[in-house]
Amino acid sequence: VKMAETCPIFYDVFFAVANGNELLLDLSLTKVNATEPERTAMKKIQDCYVENGLISRVLDGLVMTTISSSKDCMGEAVQNTVEDLKLNTLGREICPAVKRGVDLFLTGTPDEYVEQVAQYKALPVVLENARILKNCVDAKMTEEDKENALSLLDKIYTSPLC
Amino acid sequence: VKMAETCPIFYDVFFAVANGNELLLDLSLTKVNATEPERTAMKKIQDCYVENGLISRVLDGLVMTTISSSKDCMGEAVQNTVEDLKLNTLGREICPAVKRGVDLFLTGTPDEYVEQVAQYKALPVVLENARILKNCVDAKMTEEDKENALSLLDKIYTSPLC
């Protein structure tokens, strides 16, 4: 069965993290040869989703779906030249808007991250949930953890599974 | 704040259903002037997600994200003429691949629905979850319920909130 979506391994990891299922996360991370420190970093993010309960996972899943299906993401596919617009050349690369969001989630401030999410989803409950998760991640993760999460993301983005 | 995504009200309803939150579903349905029979139909679908637990919501959320960010959905945006490819003309319409999936979920057989999901996500656990949900919906919903769900979807697709 053909994996048709944009960077499938990224969404596998995201949903494993948001789901709170450690086994599923381990399976996904094994596919991209994650190191122990990289796994630890991802599990700290996962802890924040688990601590914040089901609503957190659903709302953040909504944010991810929303950004992934946004004009910004569709737009990335159509900003190239006409020759590149044939269906088979539409890259499996992760959408830059999703990349930006994930990057801000790790390296930005809560204000910046929430502002970026607000461009896609205005519901106050979604924004408040984004702020709670971001603050949790900042409190849990050391600078080294964030470095490891960023290096894992690089592996994901450059993986043949993306 | 600008709602940049494709047919936001559709995703609001989908995540309210999958979340199992009746209040959130009611709020979303009020926005599209759902009738009582239409609400009843959606609540029957919601019951299936609730009965199948958290994993069901997460896996089906993964299916939705996957289809929404697939080449098929990105592709729809680029199959038109070059003049239509300016970013600002990329519609807020729901992606036809998503429409097809929802339509099969209501009107197709379990095999047809699972086969469509399989084009986007090959994980056996995801496909099994899709089959369980589809069988549950078929058992719970009368033909009249399905008619009502389809008429509600028409309201969603043609809503100014889409």
Epitope: T109, P110, V114, N135, D138, T142, K146 | -
Partner: antibody, heavy 120, light 106 residues
Framework: QVQLVESGGGLVKPGGSLRLSCAAS????????MNWIRQAPGKGLEWISY????????YYADSVKGRFTISRDNAKNSLFLQMNSLRGEDTAVYYC?????????????WGQGTTVTVSS | EIVMTQSPDFQSVAPKEKVTITCRAS??????LHWYQQKPDQSPKLLIK???QSFSGVPSRFSGSGSGTDFTLTINSLEAEDAATYYC????????FGQGTKVEIK
């Protein structure tokens, strides 16, 4: 070691302008978010603004919004605060402070401060 | 805007005694609360980040606890050099300091 040195303070009349600078050394300046924080004589600390590492994002406290502008020059390892329409209540010691890398904390290192006096 | 309220405003404590300073947020801020120490005529120094994490080089007698809206800074055995004003800061949304607690040695 990390060093932050503020300058540019002084006496200014109400309605006047002043530009504060903060020279950073001992760390990769372009990797860090930076803040301006002030302390009025005999009073507590008041956060007034922060800027992202690239300089693309800025935030302000309501008390200074529209009057103060934070900026940075990563090539020169410098942080700035342009203060316009100054008022008596802006009289304070102004500190620049660094955030932890990847925002792991607000204000992990501070400068020694520069004094701004707004008086006619 | 989130308002941070410290108590007490002033504390006079004998050496070797325990000092407890509290900080209350006007809304839930999770664990995004930091503590600073400012000695007279000096710039502030970070003591505790994210409610309970000691910053490097800070003596072990300083500890922090709490989450949500109520936070505590504890100095376990006060020393003469600890005479200072202590501030809490929230970074949950923008940044806001508490009004400060002055600790004097008896």
């Amino acid at each position: 070691q990390v060093q932050l040195v503020e300058s540019g303070g002084g006496l200014v009349k109400p309605g006047g302008s002043l530009r504060l600078s903060c020279a950073a050394s001992g760390f990769t300046f372009s990797d860090y978010y930076m803040n301006w924080i002030r302390q009025a004589p005999g009073k507590g600390l008041e956060w007034i603004s922060y800027i992202s590492s690239s300089g693309s994002t800025t935030y302000y406290a309501d008390s200074v919004k529209g009057r103060f502008t934070i900026s940075r020059d990563n090539a020169k390892n410098s942080l700035f605060l342009q203060m316009n329409s100054l008022r008596g209540e802006d009289t304070a010691v102004y500190y620049c402070a660094r955030d932890g890398r990847y925002n792991t904390v607000a204000g992990d290192y501070w400068g020694q401060g520069t004094t701004v006096t707004v008086s006619s | 805007e989130i308002v941070m309220t410290q108590s007490p405003d002033f504390q006079s404590v004998a050496p070797k005694e325990k000092v407890t300073i509290t900080c209350r947020a006007s809304q839930n801020i999770g664990g995004s609360l930091h503590w600073y120490q400012q000695k007279p005529d000096q710039s502030p120094k970070l003591l505790i980040k994210y409610a309970s994490q000691s910053f490097s080089g800070v003596p072990s007698r300083f500890s922090g606890s709490g989450s949500g809206t109520d936070f505590t800074l504890t100095i376990n055995s006060l020393e003469a050099e600890d005479a200072a004003t202590y501030y809490c800061l929230q970074s949950y949304t923008l940044r806001t300091f508490g009004q400060g607690t002055k600790v004097e040695i008896k």
